[in-house]
């Protein structure tokens, strides 16, 4: 016969927000302030994350889970769970090792955080350029140029930058 | 031409996980944006995110940065989308999409998947 | 993020009737704005980009303007297939937006 998982052990009683107390003869104790565990039966209850300096808090911890950090005004997240924040630059830049440099001619990033990327080569695609690229905005692509009617101007110049622009995510 | 395929509709349980395939053709696949939207029953279209496949970059809507995960697979030009810890509201058709050459429109759609959360 | 106000959210109209839908943006974006046609199978194509270029294959009929907040897309004269939901979307800022949409029915 198949025995339950509560009969084997008796942790597995213990629900999310308490811990498996081996030292009160493995009563479920609810986790001690600033410790959460999100999952049942568990023997030890984890720190919670504090959002300190650059970090900011996103979501508070609970006993059932953990605090979440976002970064200040100015910075962005990186990595998973935003382990890291990086410093914004405007558009028209990216950041490098000796901080915020414009984007190089040929480039644009219509962010606030990556790299500044190549404008898109409308070509690829049969198409031709409808607007013009600048350091904060790609190219748009339109018709190849065969699809223009006679005498229709193919290039539109680029529409005035603008901030915000594309928010840092 | 230009194709965007995506896997078929999924039934699961709330609180499960759920990936989203979108193979695409015709096309050289690390050059264009692929974005992700949805539309719930009965609802507008809501922009998820999208994903750079040269180099992975990706960017989110805010509102599902903790529920959607964009990837990419350059050998076989294949967009993916994980949803998480699914509830009932997550109900919805899901597109992914490719850009016009730039990132500012979506030219291409594919037919849609339908994910259904539900006890 | 930038809200797109779309009106109406549906309308009635006659095989060759003059239909206009506008979309108002809440924040200047420029021209960076789409018009998409969701047929009733659910299919979703790009009819317009940049506010007033039509996608080649798109019939003459669907036209565009407008600039920084107030856009309109025009059918000049309803086609029975023209039956879909129409949504505007901004493509200046992220997280990009769509209008609600408009249900276009013929009478």
């Known amino acids: 016969f198949e025995r339950t998982r509560s009969l084997q052990d008796p942790c597995s009683n213990c629900p999310a927000g308490t811990f498996c107390d081996n030292n009160r003869n493995q009563i479920c104790s609810p986790c001690p302030p600033n410790s959460f565990s999100s999952a049942g039966g568990q023997r030890t209850c984890d720190i919670c994350r504090q959002c300190k300096g650059v970090f900011r808090t996103r979501k508070e911890c609970s006993s059932t889970s953990n605090a979440e950090c976002d970064c200040t005004p100015g910075f962005h997240c990186l990595g998973a769970g935003c382990s890291m924040c990086e410093q914004d630059c405007k558009q028209g830049q990216e950041l490098t090792k000796k901080g915020c440099k414009d984007c190089c001619f040929g480039t644009f990033n219509d962010q606030k955080r990556g790299i500044c990327r190549p404008w898109t080569n409308c070509s690829l695609d049969g198409k031709s350029v409808l607007v013009n690229g600048t350091k904060e905005r790609d190219v748009v692509c339109g018709p190849s140029p065969a699809d223009l009617s006679p005498g229709a101007s193919s290039v539109t110049p680029p529409a005035p930058a603008r901030e915000p622009g594309h928010s840092p995510q | 031409q230009v194709q965007l395929v995506q896997s078929g509709a999924e039934v699961k349980k709330p609180g499960a996980s759920v990936k989203v395939s979108c193979k695409a053709s015709g096309y050289t696949f690390t050059s264009y944006w692929i974005n992700w939207v949805r539309q719930a029953p009965g609802q507008g279209l809501e922009w998820i995110g999208n994903i750079y496949p040269s180099d992975s970059y990706t960017n989110y809507n805010q509102k599902f940065k903790d529920k959607a995960t964009i990837t990419a697979d350059k050998s076989t030009s294949t967009a993916y989308m994980e949803l998480s810890s699914l509830r009932s509201e997550d109900t919805a058709v899901y597109y992914c999409t490719r850009d016009y050459g730039s990132a500012y429109s979506m030219s291409t759609w594919g037919q849609g998947t339908t994910v259904t959360v539900s006890s | 993020d930038i809200q797109m106000t779309q009106s109406p959210s549906s309308l009635s109209a006659s095989v060759g009737d003059r239909v206009t839908i506008t979309c108002q943006a809440s924040?200047?974006?420029?021209?960076?704005l789409n018009w998409y046609q969701q047929k009733p199978d659910k299919t979703v194509k790009l009819l317009i980009y940049?506010?007033?270029r039509a996608r080649s294959g798109v019939p003459s009929r669907f036209s565009g303007s407008g600039s920084g907040t107030d856009f309109t897309f025009t059918i000049s004269s309803l086609q029975p297939e023209d039956i879909a939901t129409y949504f505007c979307q901004q493509g200046d800022t992220l997280p990009y937006t769509f209008g609600q949409g408009t249900k276009l029915e013929i009478k």
């Open positions: 940049y506010t007033t």
């Open positions: 924040q200047d974006i420029s021209n960076y």
